[in-house]
């Protein structure tokens, strides 16, 4: 089937980085500057994305792949292919319409992005608080109060803190 298709459609032989040029008897021509084709058999090349302004070039465009952008420091990428830049906050803060605001008591954020999340409730797992939470860090749960009675075995290692979620992409 592949051989038959090649005989019927000479364009299928054009590799990535070229296009099938109808103006030149369907021969494979290289993509012009600032354009690319990431797959074979294409009849046109796509225009390269330009990373302008606060969008910085992370990867230059080549004849076979589009440019990739990221955001100027102080902001981070959001959306497919870094279609948006969203501002960073400090740890212990979350982003709101009013800008970066401190996490409310009882919540934390250990990243520069995302939302403040409630501290782990150690008592739900029958454990005690070993290290208090802060705006930047979750509480650390220790052994249950019963484990701390005299003669009890050595302290069990704290349960790993739940990984905070990320802002929507």
């Amino acid at each position: 089937f592949e051989r038959t298709r090649s005989l019927q459609d000479p364009c299928s032989n054009c590799p990535a980085g070229t296009f099938c040029d109808n103006n030149r008897n369907q021969i494979c021509s290289p993509c012009p500057p600032n354009s690319f084709s990431s797959a074979g058999g294409q009849r046109t090349c796509d225009i390269c994305r330009q990373c302008k302004g606060v969008f910085r070039t992370r990867k230059e465009c080549s004849s076979t792949s589009n440019a990739e952008c990221d955001c100027t420091p102080g902001f981070h990428c959001l959306g497919a292919g870094c279609s948006m830049c969203e501002q960073d906050c400090k740890q212990g803060q979350e982003l709101t319409k009013k800008g970066c605001k401190d996490c409310c008591f009882g919540t934390f954020n250990d990243q520069k992005r995302g939302i403040c999340r409630p501290w782990t409730n150690c008592s739900l797992d029958g454990k005690s608080v070993l290290v208090n939470g802060t705006k930047e860090r979750d509480v650390v749960c220790g052994p249950s109060p019963a484990d701390l009675s005299p003669g009890a075995s050595s302290v069990t290692p704290p349960a790993p803190a739940r990984e905070p979620g990320h802002s929507p992409q």
Partner: nanobody, 123 residues
């Protein structure tokens, strides 16, 4: 083509005023939150202010609250930043930026940015 073009930057003395403008084209301006952000020399990009679609909600970074005023004119596809009582630390490139679809609900990402206008506050 979707585009934002800033103007109005320049050299001003401390305590002076300046009004920045941003003209939008290629999209329905009145359906988007709009923002100003700035980048001072050697510093990270910083959000400055935003305004909702009809201008009824406006928010500012603490450092400019009471000195800067953001406004918009949907009939003329224009965004403004009135800057009063300017200080040396306000020296920066100021960018106009469009809030992406869903801005304020699911994210605060800005998808279209101008190339900036330079404000220098110096005596």
């Amino acid at each position: 083509e979707v585009q934002l073009v800033e103007s109005g930057g320049g050299l001003v003395q401390p305590g002076g005023s300046l009004r920045l403008s941003c003209v939008a084209s290629g999209f329905t301006f009145s359906t988007h939150w709009m923002n100003w952000a700035r980048q001072a020399p050697g510093k990270e990009l910083e959000w400055v202010a935003n305004i909702n679609q009809d201008g009824s909600e406006k928010y500012y970074v603490d450092s400019v609250e009471g000195r800067f005023t953001i406004s918009r004119d949907n009939a003329n596809n224009s965004l403004y930043l009135q800057m009063n009582s300017l200080r040396a630390e306000d020296t920066a490139v100021y960018y106009c930026a469009r809030g992406g679809v869903g801005y304020g609900d699911s994210h605060f990402g800005m998808d279209v940015w101008g190339l900036g206008t330079t404000v220098t506050v110096s005596s």
